[in-house]
Interface confidence: low
């Protein structure tokens, strides 16, 4: 058993056949010594008396809010949550496996630049009685600070018969060093509580591996005289690290006909302009990627040829 | 050429070669099925690798103040990786395919290190750890880890030379 936060405790249970469970001793937070009784949740049934209560926690029926009273007055509470290890594996029932980039990916994170700011998100089908708290650090043995905000519900989607909820959190490394080569990964830890079930999820990554620039901005076309060619120009996104002579991007320019089946013409360039042939009804799209490290491409920025 | 004690390197040549190194490092080891090598307990492998750290002066401001600290750090790393790529880890079984980019990568590391330090000048170099994996699968894993770590190192080096070529070239 360990303390998650004040008056909230997590009991780790091997969810096993005939497992004896965990013996837990609760102590009433009061100077009083006698006349103390204990109840669980909303029930008025007295579970025991005395300053301490010893219980055997085996299943969810044994978890909940234990309250000690004296003469009708509440003295203190202890909320017991369960963390299940089932068939040798800690339960991961609360969050959905996003399966990208590999199985058992519950948390996904992205950064728009090298400033040490990143966003993580996760999915669940649970709509009520759900809380999350997020902690993060750089490295685990001698952790350096990363500050995370509160997790918020960022999107709701309907998937078949189910509703899916996306939560996200923003974190910022306290002493980020954008130009350095990371040697210790960022660790992100999410505590999830659904009713009386506790689970924790972790992700470990280097910022360089989760970089995904915003799309290029101010995408413009300039027709070239007496030619079907156009000059496409764009700018670095505002959110990208500066100076651009140091934090450089590379770009992919694509000409795409109206039908998805039409052949796509692609040009790769380190410049912020390119000359391409503009076909009728086609569109021109540009996306960006770190020039020197193959992390994710940005989403496309697009303009119609006409 | 960067002569210890002060003069500038051939920024543009270094820029071109370091960008080529980035391309080679990624073609030698694309993200293989997103193999997460940090899960494989790699403390003893990559902790000894020279990293370009915050105090090494490789940020734009540090380069403007005195690029020598940073160039020395990059030189150290290039020599370190050049030795690793020429070691039993890459030359032993399972042998690399004949057209593997590792050979070119090895030669380019050497080329860039020589651009930074001509014959007769000696910056201190870091000792290469004695890594002699006993099993072919361990060697394969070690190669992946070294190449992943090299990708991060050469990315920073390429940024340094690109910025130098754009802002510090005579």
């Amino acid at each position: 058993i360990w303390e998650l936060k004040k008056d909230v405790y997590v009991v780790e249970l091997d969810w096993y056949p005939d497992a004896p469970g965990e013996m837990v001793v609760l102590t009433c937070d009061t100077p009083e010594e006698d006349g103390i009784t204990w109840t669980l949740d909303q029930s008025s049934e007295v579970l025991g008396s005395g300053k301490t209560l010893t219980i055997q926690v085996k299943e969810f029926g044994d978890a909940g809010q234990y309250t000690c009273h004296k003469g009708g007055e509440v003295l203190s509470h202890s909320l017991l949550l369960l963390h299940k290890k089932e068939d040798g594996i800690w339960s991961t029932d609360i969050l959905k496996d996003q399966k990208e980039p590999k199985n058992k990916t519950f948390l996904r994170c992205e950064a728009k630049n090298y400033s040490g700011r990143f966003t993580c998100w996760w999915l669940t089908t649970i709509s009520t009685d759900l809380t999350f708290s997020v902690k993060s650090s750089r490295g685990s043995s001698d952790p350096q600070g990363v500050t995370c905000g509160a997790a918020t519900l960022s999107a709701e989607r309907v998937r078949g018969d189910n509703k899916e909820y996306e939560y996200s959190v923003e974190c910022q490394e306290d002493s980020a060093c954008p130009a350095a080569e990371e040697s210790l990964p960022i660790e992100v830890m999410v505590d999830a509580v659904h009713k009386l079930k506790y689970e924790n999820y972790t992700s470990s990554f280097f910022i360089r591996d989760i970089i995904k620039p915003d799309p290029p901005k101010n995408l413009q076309l300039k027709p070239l005289k007496n030619s079907r060619q156009v000059e496409v120009s764009w700018e670095y996104p505002d959110t990208w690290s500066t100076p651009h002579s140091y934090f450089s991007l590379t770009f992919c320019v694509q000409v795409q006909g109206k039908s998805k089946r039409e052949k796509k013409d692609r040009v790769f360039t380190d410049k912020t302009s390119a000359t391409v042939i503009c076909r009728k009804n086609a569109s021109i799209s540009v996306r960006a990627q770190d020039r020197y490290y193959s992390s994710s491409w940005s989403e496309w920025a697009s303009v119609p040829c006409s | 050429r960067a002569v210890p004690g002060g003069s500038s390197p051939a920024w543009t040549q270094c820029q071109q070669l370091s960008q080529k190194l980035c391309t080679l490092a990624w073609s030698a080891h694309p993200l293989v099925g997103h193999m997460d090598l940090r899960e494989e307990g790699d403390e003893e492998t990559t902790n000894d690798v020279p990293h370009i750290q915050c105090g090494d002066g490789c940020d734009p401001q540090g380069l403007r103040d005195n690029s020598q600290f940073c160039l020395q750090r990059i030189h150290q790393g290039l020599i370190f990786y050049e030795k690793l790529l020429g070691s039993d880890i890459f030359t032993g079984e399972p042998s690399l395919l004949p057209d593997s980019p590792v050979g070119q990568l090895h030669a380019s590391l050497l080329g860039l290190s020589q651009l930074l330090q001509p014959e007769g000048h000696h910056w201190e170099t870091q000792q290469i750890p004695s890594l002699s994996p006993s099993q072919p699968w361990q060697r394969l894993l070690l190669r992946f880890k070294i190449l992943r770590s090299l990708q991060a190192f050469v990315a920073v080096a390429a940024r340094v030379f690109a910025h130098g070529a754009a802002t510090l070239s005579p």
Epitope: D14, W15, Y16, P17, D18, A19, E59, F60, E86, D87, G88, I89, S91, T92, D93, I94, T125 | -
Partner: antibody, heavy 114, light 112 residues
Framework: EFQLQQSGPELVKPGASVKISCKAS????????MNWVKQSNGKSLEWIGV????????TYNQKFKGKATLTVDQSSSTAYMQLNILTSEDSAVYYC???????WGQGTLVTVSA | DIVISQDELSNPVTSGESVSISCRSS???????????LNWFLQRPGQSPQLLIY???TRASGVSDRFSGSGSGTDLTLEISRVKAEDVGVYYC?????????FGSGTKLEIK
């Protein structure tokens, strides 16, 4: 008294599907994962996958992905396994087993034959 | 996947003797929590498997103390003392340290 009662034997044609059931009684159905295991003609046991009856979440053995689909009906405390596009290789006894593998159903024999 | 190896047949034993059945795992089943995630089952002819031992050495409810489990993270042993006729059947070990859970091929126990 705790029990896992499986549906009876099935004789099915190649290419068809079959859905076998496992009804739990004597305990809180949603509190315990349900595993499914295959045993081909006196051979060893192969783990197919597991479902959490409370959330409906599943984990499959890669080998049985696309072959087996695990579902539950909480109202009747019943776990189901559907086997698709059956071939002779799928002829076997299939067991459900509660978390920890302490309790097993009696097994359902599936025979695939033209 | 973790591969579990078992010998197919144990030498026939006489009633009252002891016998050990071994099982080897391609990866350690010993977790950081100090527990070894291995089960032992007995499948008697025509019956469902019966859990004998879980967590390598803990006897399941109602299982005779003649059965005991031991081992390291990779080499595991089931010991049956004072063998009886009712112990005949196939003994399987199973790892539940990692998905997919895997079983050994089974060891058949015969009595002379």
């Amino acid at each position: 008294e705790f029990q896992l009662q499986q549906s009876g034997p099935e004789l099915v044609k190649p290419g068809a599907s079959v859905k076998i059931s496992c009804k739990a009684s004597g305990y809180s159905f949603t509190d315990h994962n349900m595993n499914w295991v295959k045993q081909s003609n006196g051979k060893s046991l192969e783990w197919i996958g597991v479902i959490n009856p409370n959330y409906g979440t599943t984990t499959y053995n890669q080998k049985f992905k696309g072959k087996a689909t695990l579902t539950v009906d909480q109202s009747s405390s019943t776990a189901y396994m559907q086997l698709n596009i059956l071939t002779s290789e799928d002829s076997a006894v299939y067991y459900c087993a509660r978390r920890g593998f302490a309790y097993w159903g009696q097994g359902t024999l599936v025979t695939v034959s033209a | 996947d973790i591969v579990i190896s078992q010998d197919e047949l144990s030498n026939p034993v006489t009633s009252g003797e002891s016998v050990s059945i071994s099982c080897r795992s391609s990866k350690s089943l010993l977790y950081k929590d100090g527990k070894t995630y291995l089960n032992w089952f007995l499948q008697r002819p025509g019956q469902s498997p019966q859990l004998l031992i879980y967590l390598m050495s803990t006897r399941a409810s109602g299982v005779s103390d003649r059965f005991s489990g031991s081992g390291s993270g990779t080499d595991l042993t089931l010991e049956i003392s004072r063998v009886k006729a009712e112990d005949v059947g196939v003994y399987y070990c199973q790892q539940i340290a990692e998905y997919p859970f895997t079983f050994g091929s089974g060891t058949k126990l015969e009595i002379k």
